[in-house]
């Protein structure tokens, strides 16, 4: 279900590129290519290259990204490009100036003095932003989302972007100061992962993170199940970062038993996060459960 040809404008192209990047990453990390044949990996990489090349058409002189060249650049979309490209660095040749230029723009143009990242040009395709949609804890959720992207680009861009460590610290300070007031499980999960990556999810914050889990196995808000899959995937990544391997198995089983294999309208974030989290689990967890995820690799016909 996951190998698709990216196409369309700056947002649609990322929607199309997401499942292919995450499928290749998942199968690489879990060493499962022999099930499908290595020639399929090559075909998938070609599609990622195509998506990458097409995305460059929507890169603005400022290094930010937007749906269209003449549209104001989006904080969220630029951060998402950073996130996907950071993962794709190990798969295809990506110009570090493209990636780190976007990082620099996020920090210099979109981060406020209090550490918050602001959005001045929301994406058109709101379905692609997952649980951030209609989120009444927008400052926390968006700041966490951008912070996670920055942390994933840190190794690649630290030398090119001097302000990156300071920006990460500032955003972390904001999340930490406001974490205890969060109401939504989604925001608790995404901000929890951002803080866990920094080693700052501890004490009362860690307690809040863990006790927000429903039945100790999922981070759930009323509404779309897709958002709960996405939130629980962030939470699983946080647990793995914390090396809390006792809490992990029921979370993994819940995600696995949702039988969520990606694809479909509005699935961009859930797809990316569930496969990223389960790949990390199979890599990190001692004595991990072998997961039988239905990753279908039907390459599009030429």
């Amino acid at each position: 279900h996951l190998i698709v040809t990216p196409s369309g404008a700056g947002e649609q192209n990322m929607i199309g590129m997401t499942p292919t990047v995450i499928a290749v990453h998942y199968l690489d990390e879990t060493e499962q290519w022999e099930k499908f044949g290595l020639e399929k990996r090559q075909g998938a990489l070609e599609l990622i290259k195509k998506g990458y090349t097409q995305q460059l058409a929507f890169r603005q002189p400022s290094s930010a990204f937007a749906a269209f060249v003449k549209r104001a650049p989006s904080t969220w979309l630029t951060a998402y490009v950073v996130k996907v490209f950071s993962l794709a660095v190990n798969l295809i040749a990506i110009d570090s100036q493209v990636l780190c230029g976007a990082v620099k723009w996020l920090i210099l143009e979109k981060q406020k003095p209090d550490g918050v990242f602001q959005e001045d040009a929301p994406v058109i395709h709101q379905e692609m932003i997952g649980g951030l949609r209609n989120n009444n804890e927008k400052d926390m959720a968006l700041t966490a989302f951008v912070l996670i992207s920055l942390q994933e680009a840190k190794d690649i861009c630290e030398e090119q972007v001097n302000s990156l460590p300071g920006s990460i610290t500032k955003a972390g300070d904001f999340l930490e100061a406001n974490y205890m007031n969060l109401q939504r499980s989604y925001t608790v999960a995404i901000a929890g992962y951002a803080l866990a990556q920094m080693g700052r999810l501890k004490g009362p914050l860690l307690n809040k993170f863990l006790t927000t889990a429903k039945d100790k196995n999922r981070w759930e808000d009323p509404g779309k199940q897709l958002y709960n899959v996405e939130a629980t995937s962030y939470a699983l990544l946080a647990l793995l970062q914390l090396k809390d391997f006792d809490f992990v198995p029921p979370v993994v089983r819940w995600l696995n038993e949702q039988r969520y294999y990606g694809g479909g309208y509005g699935s961009t974030q859930a797809t990316f996060m569930v496969f990223q989290a389960l790949a990390q689990y199979q890599k990190d967890a001692p004595d991990h459960q072998e997961l039988n995820l239905d990753v279908s690799l039907q390459l599009p016909s030429r």
């Epitope: 039945d215 100790k216 196995n217 006792d246 029921p250 038993e257 004595d287 991990h288 072998e290």
Partner: antibody, heavy 120, light 108 residues
């Protein structure tokens, strides 16, 4: 925290039956609940469980014939259809230990059980 | 369905002695295993969860351990009140979960 099952009785084969588990001292909006049965003189048999949001999980043998549902913040039902003499047993409900997945964190506490007898 | 094979079916021990009960899983279930004690006419009682964690209020003479797919419940310094039937519950997946057949423990 305590649990009590009710609804067990003598029924003829093919008759449907609903058992109810009533909890006190806690709310099912924050707890999981499992059902287990035990035929006279035999071992325990896992049926399934329901999470705090109402999602259900069943043993493969129980799928289709058994339905677990939350009827209020203090009651959970077990609906059984197409009963046979093989279903004669004491039926127990048990909460997930510390509000977690009962298959991982264990089941505690348990109700005293209710006896269902299927006979013609 | 044979998820869990429990041995022995019955055993006896003197007061102060040790009882060992084993459950063999048909495949890897990691820490998805709990142990229960049941006395005649009573519901089961949780002893151990996550293969080795002692449930609240359970005496420390009960110990759960694991080696690969073999799980062990050991009762050291057995007391008269430990006479009961013991069951393991193992879970491969939510729909592939079963109790062992039980072990009847008699205290001499």
């Amino acid at each position: 925290q305590s649990l009590e099952e009710s609804g067990g009785r003598l029924v003829t084969p093919g008759t449907p039956l609903t058992l109810t588990c009533t909890v006190s001292g806690f709310s099912l909006s924050r707890y999981t609940m499992a059902w287990v049965r035990q035929a006279p003189g035999k071992g325990l048999e896992y049926i399934g469980w329901i999470d705090s949001s109402g999602s259900t999980y069943y043993a493969s043998w129980a799928k289709g014939r058994f339905t677990i549902s939350k009827t209020s913040s203090t009651t959970v039902d077990l609906k059984m259809t197409s009963l046979t003499t093989e279903d004669t047993a004491t039926y127990f409900c048990a909460s997930g230990n510390d509000g977690g997945d009962p298959l991982y964190y264990g089941m505690d506490p348990w109700g005293p059980g209710t006896l269902v007898t299927v006979s013609s | 369905d044979g998820v869990m094979t429990q041995t022995p079916s019955s055993t006896s021990a003197a007061v102060g002695g040790t009882v060992t009960i084993k459950c063999q899983a048909s495949q890897s279930i990691r820490s998805w295993l709990s142990w229960y004690q049941q006395k005649p006419g009573q519901p089961p009682k949780l002893l151990i969860y996550e293969a080795s964690k002692l449930a609240s209020g359970v005496p420390s003479r009960f110990k759960g351990s694991r080696s690969g797919t073999e799980y062990t419940l050991a009762i050291s310094g057995v007391q008269r009140e430990d006479a009961a039937t013991y069951y393991c519950l193992g879970s491969i997946a939510s729909d592939d979960t079963a109790f062992g057949a039980g072990t009847n423990v008699e205290i001499k």
